[in-house]
């Protein structure tokens, strides 16, 4: 029976994934009962990705390691729509690391997952980035401009945002 074997496979995957993310929230995609897309609970989902707001304060490097241990990366923002979704879950009085850094301090910004940096899809606050020694990017709220990016020192602890592809079971 096709449905039975599909369910057995799904349960097997859930058991395999349970040691990394004990609880998954899944939805059926489209009309096909075969396709379930999941995010760990309590991550949020948008399009094909899952997002986690980490409220622990860590350096940029430690924040990225924390994400990668969970099978994710610091967030790579690809569109205005994605940023608009993300900011719904952020607190205005906090700053959050993005997966964007300039390791050499030469204004060669690079995303942690090697997505090409596209100057046309960036959301820097006006006047930012403004310091060659500030080599990591955060997203924060400024009353004059709402949400945008700022360059800061990488060792200064911040909250962070992790992003991973949805889990398909």
């Amino acid at each position: 029976n096709f449905m039975y074997s599909k369910t057995v496979k799904r349960l097997s995957k859930l058991r395999e994934y349970q040691q990394y993310h004990p609880s998954l929230t899944c939805v059926m995609e489209g009309k096909d009962i075969e396709d379930w897309s999941c995010c760990p609970t309590p991550w949020t989902s948008f399009q094909s990705s899952c997002y986690f707001i980490s409220t622990g304060m860590q350096s940029w490097t430690k924040s990225q390691k924390n994400c990668s241990v969970m099978g994710a990366d610091l967030v790579v923002i690809n569109t205005r729509e994605e940023q608009d979704f993300i900011i719904q879950n952020l607190k205005r009085n906090s700053s959050y690391f993005l997966g964007l850094s300039d390791p050499g301090g030469r204004r060669h910004w690079q995303w942690v997952d090697q997505t090409p940096y596209n100057e046309n899809v960036t959301f820097w606050h006006s006047g930012e980035p403004n310091n060659l020694d500030e080599r990591c990017a955060i997203i924060n709220f400024r009353s004059s401009e709402e949400w945008g990016w700022n360059d800061i020192h990488c060792h200064v602890p911040q909250k962070s945002i992790c992003k991973m592809k949805k889990i398909y079971i």
Epitope: E16, Y17, Q19, Y20, T61, Q64, K65, S68, V69, M70, G71, D73, V112, D113, Q114, M164, K165, I167, Y168
Partner: nanobody, 127 residues
Framework: QVQLQESGGGLVQAGDSLRLSCAAS????????MGWFRQAPGKEREFVAA????????NYRDSVKGRFTISRDNDLNAGYLQMNNLKPEDTAVYYC????????????????????WGQGTQVTVSS
């Protein structure tokens, strides 16, 4: 905690071959994408090759394409880097790294995407 151990390095002549191995502890190796990176003296650690958790997808840095082949054996909890036609510029310490992933097809190229690293094995290619 995942632990990794590389082996297979050594001193060879230009044009020779080596096969590096990476042994992983634990029984969940198949949940991890694997990458090989290298670091020459005084240089940044750089991406060499990566393979998805299923083994179906691979990525290579341009300078090793056609010479190096990455593979894995999930039953043996091991990964490999077959290096042919070695050149003096391949001289470096080679590291294997693992990254948890729920995608069977992604082969990650960013060194910061890998939280688990081995101690490295030295490869020296003389001319």
């Amino acid at each position: 905690q995942v632990q990794l151990q590389e082996s297979g390095g050594g001193l060879v002549q230009a044009g020779d071959s080596l096969r590096l191995s990476c042994a992983a502890s634990g029984n969940t190796f198949s949940m991890y994408a694997m990458g090989w990176f290298r670091q020459a003296p005084g240089k940044e650690r750089e991406f060499v090759a990566a393979i998805s958790r299923s083994g179906g997808s691979t990525n290579y840095r341009d300078s090793v394409k056609g010479r190096f082949t990455i593979s894995r054996d999930n039953d043996l909890n091991a990964g490999y880097l077959q290096m042919n036609n070695l050149k003096p510029e391949d001289t470096a310490v080679y590291y294997c790294a693992l990254r948890l992933t729920f995608s069977t097809t992604d082969a990650y190229t960013g060194k910061l995407q890998y939280p688990y690293w081995g101690q490295g094995t030295q490869v020296t290619v003389s001319s």
